[in-house]
């Protein structure tokens, strides 16, 4: 008996061939001996089976002695043994229909779990193997679960169902709802305008939800909400914003926030959360602000940074085109009695300059100038 695997919702074509290459009397029936379809000469006739409106054949092939049974929009319950009778011969085909579906939704938040459920006909014992877009393989029986979805899990999952040494392949598109970056850091000199961007890693037709930016300033004892906003069909509208600092927000995606000026009291970490309509859980992106200030007070040239810096960052003070006068893994450095000239304060990571502030030290009879 020939075995054919089908996919729920798809179309399958079961073949039946006569020894004579001409149109002759044929009919298909199921295991309950109920007629599905047959012919009356060159015309088709349909039996009273449940398949009635989904069963078909190809009349154009009858003259070649081929009498296929086509079943459209396959259902799991179409799994059965189908018998083609042509001339005095019988051909039996066992059709097994499988379905693979993702739990509830194919749009899942980062960190959530994905469960794939296999629908299979009674008596079958299939095995399933799925390959994620990042090449990770998972195996299972009736259900497969992947916990803690990551951004790289977005894309087409390819699942292979194996039964009777035959296989059928399913492709399921999974969208992991997340920001493009889990965390970002912005380095600014005191007084500069700060731009925060929160690009999403997915695109959907309609995006509706609400969000908030909570900020923990390094100098503050507790965090506070800087801004709350609504998102309706990709349009952003501000609901509430603090007076200090007075953030501005772009009206379109990607989410964009502007801080008029970087000040030491604003340096710190923020957490932008976005709750999407009809989704449990929230999207998160961390954002950090590091602010630099270079000052000269009397005979002391000081460079300071505020905000979340890693211990391996180097803060240096150097006279232009000269070796660094001072270089430390600290958040403040200074030079006493600096010589006149253009001094540079540099925040660097493994030789790469992240932030730079210049200050001009004048001869001792004049006051310093900050460009």
């Amino acid at each position: 008996k020939k075995v054919v695997l089908g996919k729920k919702g798809d179309t399958v074509e079961l073949t039946c061939t006569a020894s004579q290459k001409k149109s002759i009397q044929f009919h298909w029936k199921n295991s309950n001996q109920i007629k599905i379809l047959g012919n009356q000469g060159s015309f088709l006739t349909k039996g009273p089976s449940k398949l009635n409106d989904r069963a078909d054949s190809r009349r154009s092939l009858w003259d070649q002695g081929n009498f296929p049974l086509i079943i459209k929009n396959l259902k799991i319950e179409d799994s059965d043994t189908y018998i083609c009778e042509v001339e005095d011969q019988k051909e039996e085909v066992q059709l097994l229909v499988f379905g693979l579906t993702a739990n509830s939704d194919t749009h899942l938040l980062q960190g959530q779990s994905l469960t794939l459920t296999l629908e299979s006909p009674p008596g079958s014992s299939p095995s399933v193997q799925c390959r994620s877009p990042r090449g990770k393989n998972i195996q299972g029986g009736k259900t497969l679960s992947v916990s803690q979805l990551e951004l790289q899990d977005s894309g087409t999952w390819t699942c292979t169902v194996l039964q009777n040494q035959k296989k059928v392949e399913f492709k399921i598109d999974i969208v992991v709802l997340a920001f493009q970056k889990a965390s970002s850091i912005v380095y600014k000199k005191e007084g500069e305008q700060v731009e925060f961007s929160f690009p999403l890693a997915f695109t959907v037709e309609k995006l509706t939800g609400s969000g908030e930016l909570w900020w923990q300033a390094e100098r503050a004892s507790s965090s506070k909400s800087w801004i709350t906003f609504d998102l309706k069909n990709k349009e952003v509208s501000v609901k509430r914003v603090t007076q200090d600092p007075k953030l501005q927000m772009g009206k379109k995606l990607p989410l964009h926030l502007t801080l008029p000026q970087a000040l030491p009291q604003y340096a710190g970490s923020g957490n932008l959360t976005l709750a999407l309509e009809a989704k449990t859980g929230k999207l998160h992106q961390e954002v950090n602000l590091v602010v630099m200030r270079a000052t000269q007070l009397q005979k002391n040239l000081t460079c300071e940074v505020w905000g979340p810096t890693s211990p391996k960052l180097m803060l240096s003070l150097k006279l232009e085109n000269k070796e660094a006068k001072v270089s430390k893994r600290e958040k403040a450095v200074w030079v006493l009695n600096p010589e006149a000239g253009m001094w540079q304060c540099l925040l660097s990571d493994s030789g790469q300059v992240l932030l730079e502030s210049n200050i001009k030290v004048l001869p001792t009879w004049s006051t310093p100038v900050q460009p």
Epitope: Q25, L44, G47
Partner: antibody, heavy 118, light 111 residues
Framework: QVQLVQSGAEVKKPGASVKVSCKAS????????ISWVRQAPGQGLEWMGE????????YYNEKFKGRVTNTRDTSTSTVYMELSSLRSEDTAVYYC???????????WGQGTLVTVSS | DIVMTQSPDSLAVSLGERATINCKAS??????????SNWYQQKPGQPPKLLIY???NLESGVPDRFSGSGSGTDFTLTISSLQAEDVAVYYC?????????FGGGTKVEIK
Amino acid sequence: QVQLVQSGAEVKKPGASVKVSCKASGYTFTAYVISWVRQAPGQGLEWMGEIYPGSGSSYYNEKFKGRVTNTRDTSTSTVYMELSSLRSEDTAVYYCARSGDGSRFVYWGQGTLVTVSS
Amino acid sequence: DIVMTQSPDSLAVSLGERATINCKASQSVDYDGDSYSNWYQQKPGQPPKLLIYVASNLESGVPDRFSGSGSGTDFTLTISSLQAEDVAVYYCQQSLQDPPTFGGGTKVEIK
């Protein structure tokens, strides 16, 4: 030429069975479906079932399922229809008919009158 | 089952006149460009005789005054010029889906 010759009239008592024959000639017996159609006095036509002479597979109208049996004898090119548990409303002319291109009933037998009476 | 409803139940037409019989199916009997509707003529004491198959095809040996038309659910048998030998009962039938079903019949008489 194609000919379907049926057996003669029958009188049966309620609860009995009747077996009507239909002998085919003038064509390849196994190549065409044969149906049974009945007509009660002064009434319309009603399809009872069909047989594929090649394989012997039969299909029946749900209305008659369990009471009607179609069989065939390829050696004599004859098809039989047996109706059991007869009741008075089964009194009718029973026809065998052969399919053709586009229709189930191109050639007809002359009919067999079955009378069910106590 | 597909129900075939014929109208009228009986029809009296003068010799040489046109006779028209209608048949309505409870659902479409169209498939793959063809309409699976057939017409039969039955005279007293005789088996039915196929006149038209697949809505409009004239069975061989049938006079061309008989014609069939229609598609989907509505079908018509027309006798363009009624002859004395056309007095009979006419049945429509669908052959797309089992069980094949017949209309109740239309008796055609001469006026």
